[in-house]
């Protein structure tokens, strides 16, 4: 079951999954300048058995001016492992999520691939949130969101997480040592049901959040 | 030249039922996303609902869930909004777009489509 709407926003925040439930569908976006191959897949599906998950169907880019131009998806395993090395892990994670069975990792870029990420999110995905940069994060509790179903309907729980303006950045997800306890806010009831996460903030945790389905800027 | 034509608004009383369609042409690509935007006088564009042309993933705004069904005709090209159990509220222009590439949903998800038609007028009475 896919989740209808978006993490909660938290203002000053950006939020990521460590790994994504069987079901996650990744959309196949490409840079300006460039599109998906004529017959090529809308989605990045992550499918598998109970003992391994991968992601299914190539993302394919090609020059938006040069029709025959493909570019492949899937790097060579060398170049996927090197790449795997810039994910963060988290520090307050007993158990690699990305290894738990029923979860596929970080898809790997794909050539001229658009910046950020919309992922349709299925029920039971959690994600975390991390304020960014130039913000400090106060929290009472877990600073992650979790798609729940509840009566025939989905929602995210909302994470306790306040990012004041202190110029000192806490790491993903909710390294900082708690501190102040704000009030929980209510559950969430935003509307945008696609999430799109800069793609950055997987290498650069210090990215600015530039969602697309909240802001314009991008997308 | 993409060109997507809107039909099948009109004045209808609350409670009652109207189909939107949208038939696209020129569109070079075998499978792209649609969706429904509807703007009322003095408010931003709202989406309403989008789906791709194979169906994979459908998805609605929370404000016309459970009311409102986006489907595709017998040409590909071409997408239905079946509205019902209308309310004032509803009254607005209502888009259809277009985009190369996954359904994008949401409160500011507009600026990701990027072929649009004209627009056509639904009035909901009390």
């Known amino acids: 079951e896919l989740c209808d709407d978006d993490p909660p926003e938290i203002p000053h925040a950006t939020f990521k999954a460590m790994a994504y439930k069987e079901g996650t569908m990744l959309n196949c976006e490409c840079k300006r300048g460039f599109r998906r191959i004529k017959s090529g897949s809308l989605y990045m599906l992550c499918t598998g058995n109970s003992s391994h998950s991968s992601w299914d169907n190539q993302c394919q880019c090609t020059s938006s001016a040069t029709r025959n131009t493909t570019k492949q998806v899937t790097p060579q395993p060398e170049e996927q492992k090197e790449r795997k090395t810039t994910e963060m892990q988290s520090p307050m994670q007993p158990v690699d999520q990305a290894s738990l069975p029923g979860h596929c990792r970080e898809p790997p870029p794909w050539e001229n691939e658009a910046t950020e990420r919309i992922y349709h999110f299925v029920v039971g995905q959690m994600v975390y949130y991390q304020c960014v940069q130039g913000y400090r994060a106060l929290h009472r509790g877990p600073a992650e969101s979790v798609c729940k179903m509840t009566h025939g309907k989905t929602r995210w729980t909302q994470p306790q997480l306040i990012c004041t303006g202190e110029m000192e950045t806490s790491q993903f997800p909710g390294e900082e040592k708690p501190q102040a306890s704000p009030e929980g806010r209510p559950e969430s009831e935003t509307s945008c049901l696609v999430t799109t996460t800069d793609f950055q903030i997987q290498t650069e945790m210090a990215a600015t959040m530039e969602t697309s389905i909240f802001t314009t800027e991008y997308q | 030249q993409v060109q997507l034509v809107e039909s099948g608004g009109g004045l209808v009383q609350a409670g009652g039922s109207l189909r939107l369609s949208c038939a696209a042409s020129g569109i070079p690509f075998d499978n792209y996303a649609m969706g429904w935007f509807r703007q009322a006088p003095g408010k931003e564009r709202e989406f309403v609902a989008a789906?791709?042309?194979?169906?994979?993933?459908?998805r609605y705004g929370d404000s016309v869930k459970g009311r409102f069904t986006i489907s595709r005709g017998n040409a590909k090209n071409t997408v239905f909004l079946q509205m019902n159990s209308l309310k004032p509220e509803d009254t607005a222009v209502y888009y259809c777009?277009?985009?190369?590439?996954?359904?994008?949903?949401?409160?500011?998800?507009?600026?990701?489509?990027?072929?649009w038609g004209q627009g056509t007028q639904v009035t909901v009475s009390s």
């Open positions: 777009a277009a985009r190369d590439g996954g359904v994008v949903a949401g409160s500011r998800s507009s600026a990701q489509y990027n072929y």
């Open positions: 789906r791709d042309l194979e169906g994979i993933i459908t």
